[in-house]
Amino acid sequence: NQDLPVIKCVLINHKNNDSSVGKSSSYPMVSESPEDLGCALRPQSSGTVYEAAAVEVDVSASITLQVLVDAPGNISCLWVFKHSSLNCQPHFDLQNRGVVSMVILKMTETQAGEYLLFIQSEATNYTILFTVSIRNTLLYTLRRPYFRKMENQDALVCISESVPEPIVEWVLCDSQGESCKEESPAVVKKEEKVLHELFGTDIRCCARNELGRECTRLFTIDLNQTPQTTLPQLFLKVGEPLWIRCKAVHVNHGFGLTWELENKALEEGNYFEMSTYSTNRTMIRILFAFVSSVARNDTGYYTCSSSKHPSQSALVTIVEKGFINATNSSEDYEIDQYEEFCFSVRFKAYPQIRCTWTFSRKSFPCEQKGLDNGYSISKFCNHKHQPGEYIFHAENDDAQFTKMFTLNIRRKPQVLAEASASQASCFSDGYPLPSWTWKKCSDKSPNCTEEITEGVWNRKANRKVFGQWVSSSTLNMSEAIKGFLVKCCAYNSLGTSCETILLNSPGPFPFIQDNIS
């Protein structure tokens, strides 16, 4: 049938906040560029059926399935999904093509399946078939990138075996230290797998997909830099590739570099050299030491020597399993209300950890910084002076680590009171934990100085709200105090706070708060 229209099917992904089920209309949302679904006539099908490429959608994502029909005259249409008919409102675009849309907001399992669009034009009838499924993110992985030498070329290939396929980029920096932070103007990013320019100061490769971003730094010894006070250490797991770059700059080409492992020269095929002249006509040489798949016997001191520079070494440690080394004993801190303070955890780990800080069931992003001694540190300063229990959790492919912190904020007590027919209770969250006194106000003691000692029950640290201790004191009612005003006072080294309660028959109780410094 050669009178068939030319049709185009597209998928539009939306960034939206709305929630609803399928709407067969155009819906105003921020959209990404349409993806052609390659709708093509199904061969030899009974009736005229066009079929679109399978559509995989993330849970809760919003999409539009759109059909553009290049056919003369009017068209009418009907969507069918799981034997239910859905309304269809075609319209015409500026090129006079018929446009039919199906919006799926907040994708759920119930919205996955086959969407059939029946179109009737003046010339013919036809069906368009869309298969929509939820993307199985359980199969997703994001693996740390590693390096391989490109065959027959002096270049490195960056590989990350991840699903979905990640975008791989090289992150290059020619400055030192802080200026090589990710968003610094000194940092250059190249979105490609192969890198030929291997002379830079700092070279990292990063891979990113829907799960996030993982980076690997090219371990470098720079013979022109003053050696670190502690020997640099590189950890690898059995089977992983080893790459160490030795770099040296000299006024002319009259120098050479060599690698040794435990005072034995590396075998040929385990190193390659590159050299170039820099802008000021000095010679830069780099010598790579590499092992495509390390074994336990590749552990040791790798020393890079030069005929014109002092040699430098790195300790390479090959482990069977990843690890996280840190002290997991819980730590308690006591700070003033306006004192600057950060929690910190110092650890040594391989592979690099993923971590979170948690307080009050809420997770906070975790930043980690490498120290010169091979350790890393993670700090958390965003506690907003809220007392309680803070948890640091770290994990990598092979190990997990949790550390608890308690933060106490020194402040004078604040008292809350409640009363029933048989007792009155006062609560305070001040720190240090307060002590309690109860006083009776009467004609004899208008200033409420008459102390009550009987029927008082103090419970220190009664309930723990996300690690925040609350102290309470309860007064059991007796005939002697019924109908009187009583005052409960909580005091610690920072001050005193009181609350006055009228003990009468059951009913609403008036509370009068006193703050006594």
């Epitope: 390659g38 006539l41 199904r42 030899q44 490429a53 298969t131 199985n136």
Partner: antibody, heavy 120, light 107 residues
Framework: EVQLLESGGGLVQPGGSLRLSCAPS????????MAWVRQAPGKGLEWVSS????????YYRDSVKGRFTISRDNSKNTLYLQMNSLRAEDTAVYYC?????????????WGQGTMVTVSS | DIQMTQSPSSLSASVGDRVTITCRAS??????LAWYQQKPGKVPKLLIY???SLHSGVPSRFSGSGSGTDFTLTISSLQPEDVATYFC?????????FGQGTKLEIK
Amino acid sequence: EVQLLESGGGLVQPGGSLRLSCAPSGFTFSNYGMAWVRQAPGKGLEWVSSIHSGGGDTYYRDSVKGRFTISRDNSKNTLYLQMNSLRAEDTAVYYCARGRTPTGYYFDHWGQGTMVTVSS
Amino acid sequence: DIQMTQSPSSLSASVGDRVTITCRASEGIHNGLAWYQQKPGKVPKLLIYNANSLHSGVPSRFSGSGSGTDFTLTISSLQPEDVATYFCQQYYDYPLTFGQGTKLEIK
């Protein structure tokens, strides 16, 4: 990254049998139609057979009907081609190809191929 | 079966030239046509589908046109990496059939 890896090729005598397998990765196998396409040495491409994403519908070229069977196991992520009563003219590199759509009739990804030689 | 005939069977052109390869179907196939590129020793690669839709990642110098029985693949400015054999394929009806191929070389 979409990858298709064929296996099972080899040398077989006329009248013999072979079973080709194709292991896909990097995509949701059960969403795509799959096919086998062959290429005799120094010759052009020849479609052999296709199978729908769900496995229900299969299609064959006339010269292999009754001798070849295409099948898939979506739980194992594998495509198969069972070839019986092989003839000399079946000698070719057999490519596993992913269809762009659930029925799969034009092909956006191809495997590296596996060589089938039918000779006495 | 629908026969697909490509012409020419081979051609030689210079870098920068505009190159055209044609494919004729023995009966009308609407727009059910794909074009593939196969470099020496490599596997086929999809270039065009639905006669004129460029597959993602394919350089824009490639384009397809035609409908019914006559189809064309055009390379607007030939590059050295375009040396390959080009195949058309119809998917209007089973059995799916390919053209015999056009071998493209650089002068």
